[in-house]
């Protein structure tokens, strides 16, 4: 928008610096850390958000706890390399020249190696399983009401097309949300399931990336839905390549 006298901000990403220096005095916002321009009418990519998070002071939180079920983010935060579109580069390296391959959500999918490690392509994460445990309530939530509320959340807040929310499972107190999005299904302008899952994760942890209203107000028939634990599992279109040593 035009921001002649207004403070200029990005409603969908707190981790930005904005100024009215775009064409015609329009507000232009750039992600912290990378300096890349972001579209403030949609979600910012997870890669740019992680990079911004690493550039901000006093951030030492890990993402999700290790699990043996599927590919999970055991490595926690790192300062990623993003491509010009804001996606993760297939190969990531740290300052000590240790390198590894990642998937489209930035989770390591190979053993760590040196600078000779090759990552031929960015492998797409096509299935994300979000595993939640809610705080005790007087009774179990009605499954269909819970399903409707969570589908509505992903459609409205993260602008994720309803077809990408494959299922919502519920066995009190565990809720599982399945997001599925193949390369062939994702059209131009579609929100990526990895970005939606990351925004959701931050919302659930009380670290909303949105400005304005900010935090979530999840309710099922008026009853607050409060999450006390989150685990996120990532499944790639091509299985990860880890040595047998890691699997034992």
């Amino acid at each position: 928008h035009t921001a002649a006298q207004d403070n200029c901000t990005c409603p969908t990403n707190k981790m930005t610096v904005c100024s009215p220096d775009g064409p015609g005095g329009r507000c232009q916002c750039r992600a912290l850390g990378s300096g890349m321009a972001v579209d403030c009418s949609t979600l910012t990519s997870k890669c740019l958000l992680l990079k911004a998070r690493m550039s901000a002071p006093k951030n030492a939180r890990t993402l999700v706890r290790p699990s043996e079920h599927a590919l999970v983010d055991n490595d926690g935060l790192y300062d990623p390399d993003c491509d010009p579109e804001g996606r993760f580069k297939a190969r990531q390296c740290n300052q000590t020249s240790v390198c590894w391959c990642v998937n489209s959500v930035g989770v390591r999918r190979t053993d760590k190696g040196d600078l000779s490690l090759r990552c031929d392509e960015l492998v797409r994460t096509h299935h994300i399983l979000i595993d939640l445990r809610h705080r005790p309530t007087a009774g179990a939530f009605n499954h269909s009401d819970l399903d409707a509320e969570l589908r509505r959340l992903f459609r409205e807040r993260y602008r994720l097309h309803p077809k990408f929310v494959a299922a919502v499972h519920y066995e009190q107190p565990t809720i599982q949300i399945e997001l599925r999005q193949n390369t062939s299904q994702k059209a131009a302008g579609d929100v990526d399931i990895g970005d939606a899952a990351y925004y959701f994760e931050r919302d659930i942890k009380g670290e909303s990336l949105f400005q304005g209203r900010g935090g979530l107000d999840l309710r099922v028939r008026g009853e607050p839905l409060q999450v006390e634990r989150t685990l996120i599992y990532y499944l790639d279109e091509i299985p990860p390549k880890f040595s047998m040593k890691r699997l034992t």
């Epitope: 928008h1 403070n7 901000t9 949609t42 409205e156 400005q211 304005g212 209203r213 309710r219």
Partner: antibody
Framework: AVTLDESGGGLQTPGGGLSLVCKAS????????MFWVRQAPGKGLEWVGV????????NYAPAVKGRATISRDNGQSTLRLQLNNLRAEDTGTYYC???????????????????WGHGTEVIVSS | ALALTQPSSVSANPGETVKITCSGG???YGWYQQKSPGSAPVTVI????KRPSNIPSRFSGSLSGSTNTLIITGVQAEDEAVYFC????????????FGAGTTLTVL
């Protein structure tokens, strides 16, 4: 059918307060954000404020901030606007409206209104 | 505060297609028809392109960038009214806002 019925308008004195009530029916009130919008005579629409479905969040236009309080009773399906320290420029028709996007990051947007009340007229004059 | 920009007036012959633009906000635009001052507005489009079930299909909405367009395909005499667009001011405060209104005259 969705019905929003405002009441409480009328002649008010400057410096005084008013309380407008909107009675909702025909939908699950607890599932929707609600707005107040007003229109001064011969002027355009003006967003007054919003309350989320649980009542835990409110936001107000700069022109009424500090003077307005929006509240709701989900059990009675009623929305209320309390406006104090009334001024002549508060004169107009006040509409209660329903928001269609309670989870949206920009849920305060006037662009999510999908239903309106008939309005109640407020005149602030001595 | 941010203002939404829309033309003050447009005119068309019956049966023609009318386009009214609204710009200056973020996604989350709506269009509201008011046939006379003080009468209750009627939502013709909300959330960029959603049409209430009681609104004729000749009304549609389209979002391109930060500009929303109300399209009336085959305008009719009863469509003559003032059309207000609604949106979102993303400068701190994050409030709802309306455009000044566009008067549609059907010739």
């Amino acid at each position: 059918a969705v019905t929003l019925d405002e009441s409480g308008g009328g002649l008010q004195t400057p410096g005084g307060g008013l309380s407008l009530v909107c009675k909702a029916s025909g939908f699950d009130f607890i599932d929707y954000d609600m707005f107040w919008v007003r229109q001064a005579p011969g002027k355009g629409l003006e967003w007054v404020g919003v309350i989320n479905r649980s009542g835990s969040y409110t936001n107000y236009a700069p022109a009424v901030k500090g003077r307005a309080t929006i509240s709701r009773d989900n059990g009675q399906s009623t929305l209320r606007l309390q406006l104090n320290n009334l001024r002549a420029e508060d004169t107009g028709t006040y509409y209660c409206a329903r928001g269609a996007c309670t989870h949206c990051w920009d849920a305060d947007s006037a662009g999510y209104i999908d239903a309106w009340g008939h309005g109640t007229e407020v005149i602030v004059s001595s | 505060a941010l203002a939404l920009t829309q033309p003050s007036s447009v005119s068309a012959n019956p049966g023609e297609t009318v386009k009214i633009t609204c710009s200056g906000g973020y996604s989350g635009y709506g269009w509201y028809q008011q046939k006379s001052p003080g009468s209750a507005p009627v939502t013709v489009i909300y959330w960029n392109d959603k049409r209430p079930s009681n609104i004729p299909s000749r009304f549609s909405g389209s979002l391109s960038g930060s500009t929303n367009t109300l399209i009336i395909t085959g305008v009719q005499a009863e469509d003559e009214a003032v059309y207000f667009c609604g949106g979102y001011d993303s400068s701190p405060g994050y409030v709802g806002i309306f455009g000044a209104g566009t008067t549609l005259t059907v010739l």
